[in-house]
Interface confidence: medium
């Protein structure tokens, strides 16, 4: 339904709050670098004339692309070329390719100074002098930093970070109350932009097929009651909104997933029983409910999937006739029947699937070459139902701390090439899956590890891509997206590494290591780890603990010490000396 | 193929308690959910209880609240947990696997009486 004017038909179905929220967002993840006063000047100016559209649909300009308009304000931007570089180039191109390229330039390591909380008196205070800069501060900061966060889930977030200040402002003590609040929503929000990261990577490297086939495996696993014409719907939907949100254009993915969010729950009872309860939320919380909502029953006495899809003497004709709805059909019987699977391990099979009817609908004998399909899907399953297991128990041995540096060791070993910050970074959230998952039964811990790590690991492609120095990075995060985690795990040792020249300059330690939380000293202690594998690629388990333990016993006494930056300087010494010996450096 | 063998049964007295067991043996990784049927003579085979392999359960009204089902995967056996009996849950006793590739497996079945 062709409207004469985009930007009028966004700003009347969005309402003038969430327009100006939703271009800020868009502005701030792909200029990332401009002072957040800049930007609120330019989504004024953008608002402005947007009413005057609403107004007037046949005004001058307003019959033009959200696209074109908005790339035409981000190129008014004085001080491009010096910020931005090359970025400035992409205001000679023509849309679309003006558009491209500023997606090509999004950067998900930003070079910016890390958020620091100010005092809470400071906040509140803050909060109430100007409630609305305050929160489109709040949007800003994290939207330049996570260039890929969904931004309709950003709005909720916002809507969440506003109660929290409304109610703990006024609190006895506001501390307890505010602070964590904000942890939850810092951690949640860390953990919904890694997510979104992944759906953007899915669709921008591996195509609208690789994310629908995702979708159809999610979707058949919340809602196995509802028929595979209702799920190729929704995830027909779910697709265009996610196209709509990695491609940047966030108006229109804020409208679609509230048109969406309006049929799940119009149609609810030929989707799920589990609905009810988000249906009868606002529009944000009913969209985040119903992204989150739990599984369906399984629906009872489902048939054996061996009839349709290898009894059959129909198979390849089937197949053959429309190949994709038939694989499709495939995923959906499979994963709502198996909500104790990973999602790319659904997918690893419905590909193992495909390839052997590709091979076997060509033969002599199609159904004597397909008929033992199954007993290939046995090995795929128990690889990580395995993993999973003998990794829940060394995280029940070790406990967090020590498990992360267990994957710290193991993939700095493997992948020594690639910076110590994505190491720690990429192994600590790694090392998160057990206290996230192992603590779940067994039926859930394979969906809850496995896709996760599918996360974390998109993680540590999206940062090497920007800087790739690792073969065996490119190889696993290129090849296969569903296998990448079974990639990873593969690699060996790397034994063409030549280990990094000594240098006591990254181990020399300071009294201001006493003063950092907990977490901030794990992550030095951690750095320093990886260091050390890095000079030291052969170290036992055994050398680099005895290291540890007496690098964590330094850090204990000098922070003790009365002295303290004599205590570093000197014991500082003694602990790289004996760390050279212990190693054999 | 899944293979299934149950055990446990036996004579009880009414309030009183027993524990079924199921192993289930061959293509044990393509389960999805197993169950509890029972058939009392001259009856129809009854749907007692299920659990999916994601974790959730379903009960007959008539067991509500007295039996309690569960699996444990990485043994490949189902569990019925039967507490405060009655003379009316006499009966065989049934597991049941259905599969996501094979036809759905039954076990031979034991014999549960409830009698004083």
């Known amino acids: 339904d062709a409207h004469k004017s985009e930007v009028a038909h966004r700003f009347k179905d969005l309402g003038e709050e969430n327009f100006k929220a939703l271009v800020l967002i868009a502005f701030a993840q792909y200029l990332q670098q401009c002072p957040f006063e800049d930007h609120v000047k330019l989504v004024n100016e953008v608002t402005e004339f947007a009413k005057t559209c609403v107004a007037d649909e046949s005004a001058e300009n307003c019959d033009k692309s959200l696209h074109t308009l908005f790339g035409d304000k981000l190129c008014t931007v004085a001080t491009l070329r010096e910020t931005y570089g090359e970025m400035a180039d992409c205001c000679a191109k023509q849309e679309p390719e003006r558009n491209e390229c500023f997606l090509q330039h999004k950067d998900d390591n930003p070079n910016l100074p890390r958020l620091v909380r100010p005092e809470v008196d400071v906040m509140c205070t803050a909060f109430h002098d100007n409630e609305e800069t305050f929160l489109k501060k709040y949007l800003y900061e994290i939207a330049r930093r996570h260039p890929y966060f969904y931004a309709p889930e950003l709005l909720f977030f916002a809507k969440r970070y506003k109660a929290a200040f409304t109610e703990c402002c006024q609190a006895a003590d506001k501390a307890a109350c505010l602070l964590p609040k904000l942890d939850e929503l810092r951690d949640e929000g860390k953990a919904s932009s890694a997510k979104q990261r992944l759906k953007c990577a899915s669709l921008q490297k591996f195509g609208e097929r690789a994310f629908k086939a995702w979708a159809v495996a999610r979707l058949s696993q919340r809602f196995p009651k509802a028929e595979f014409a209702e799920v190729s719907k929704l995830v027909t939907d779910l697709t265009k909104v996610h196209t709509e949100c990695c491609h940047g254009d966030l108006l229109e993915c804020a409208d679609d997933r509230a048109d969406l969010a309006k049929y799940i729950c119009e149609n609810q009872d030929s989707i799920s029983s589990k609905l009810k309860e988000c249906c009868e939320k606002p529009l944000l919380e009913k969209s985040h409910c119903i992204a989150e909502v739990e599984n369906d029953e399984m629906p009872a006495d489902l048939p054996s999937l061996a009839a349709d899809f290898v009894e059959s003497k129909d198979v390849c004709k089937n197949y053959a006739e429309a190949k994709d709805v038939f694989l499709g059909m495939f995923l959906y019987e499979y994963a709502r029947r198996h909500p104790d699977y990973s999602v790319v391990l659904l997918l690893r099979l419905a590909k193992t699937y495909e390839t052997t009817l590709e091979k076997c609908c060509a033969a002599a004998d199609p159904h004597e070459c397909y008929a033992k399909v199954f007993d290939e899907f046995k090995p795929l399953v128990e690889e990580p139902q395995n993993l999973i297991k003998q990794n829940c128990e060394l995280f029940e041995q070790l406990g967090e701390y020590k498990f992360q540096n267990a994957l710290l060791v193991r993939y700095t070993k493997k992948v020594p090439q690639v910076s110590t910050p994505t190491l720690v970074e990429v192994s600590r959230n790694l090392g998160k899956v057990g206290s996230k998952c192992c603590k779940h039964p067994e039926a859930k811990r394979m969906p809850c590890a496995e896709d996760y790590l599918s996360v974390v690991l998109n993680q540590l492609c999206v940062l090497h891509e920007k800087t790739p120095v690792s073969d065996r990075v490119t190889k696993c995060c290129t090849e296969s997206l569903v296998n990448r985690r079974p990639c990873f795990s593969a690699l060996e040792v790397d034994e063409t590494y030549v280990p990094k020249e000594f240098n006591a300059e990254t181990f020399t330690f300071h009294a201001d290591i006493c003063t950092l939380s907990e977490k901030e000293r794990q992550i030095k202690k951690q750095t320093a780890l990886v260091e050390l594998v890095k000079h030291k690629p052969k170290a036992t388990k055994e050398q680099l603990k005895a290291v540890m333990d007496d690098f964590a016993a330094f850090v204990e006494k000098c922070c003790k010490a009365d002295d303290k930056e004599t205590c570093f300087a000197e014991e500082g010494k003694k602990l790289v000396a004996a760390s050279q010996a212990a190693l054999g450096l | 193929q899944v293979q299934l063998v149950e055990s446990g049964g036996g004579l009880v007295q009414p309030g009183g308690s027993l524990r079924l067991s199921c192993a289930a043996s061959?293509?044990?990784?393509?389960?999805?959910?197993l169950a509890w049927y029972r058939q009392a003579p001259g009856k129809q085979r009854d749907l007692v209880a299920r659990?999916?392999?994601?974790?959730?359960?379903h009960y007959a009204d008539s067991v509500k609240g007295r039996f309690t089902v569960s699996r444990d995967n990485a043994e490949n056996t189902l569990v019925l947990q039967m507490n405060s009996l009655k003379p009316e849950d006499t009966a065989v006793y049934y597991c049941?696997?259905?599969?996501?590739?094979?036809?759905?497996?039954w076990g031979q079945g034991t014999q549960v009486t409830v009698s004083s």
């Open positions: 659990i999916s392999s994601g974790g959730s359960t």
């Open positions: 049941y696997a259905q599969s996501t590739w094979y036809p759905p497996s």
């Open positions: 061959g293509s044990t990784w393509s389960i999805n959910t």
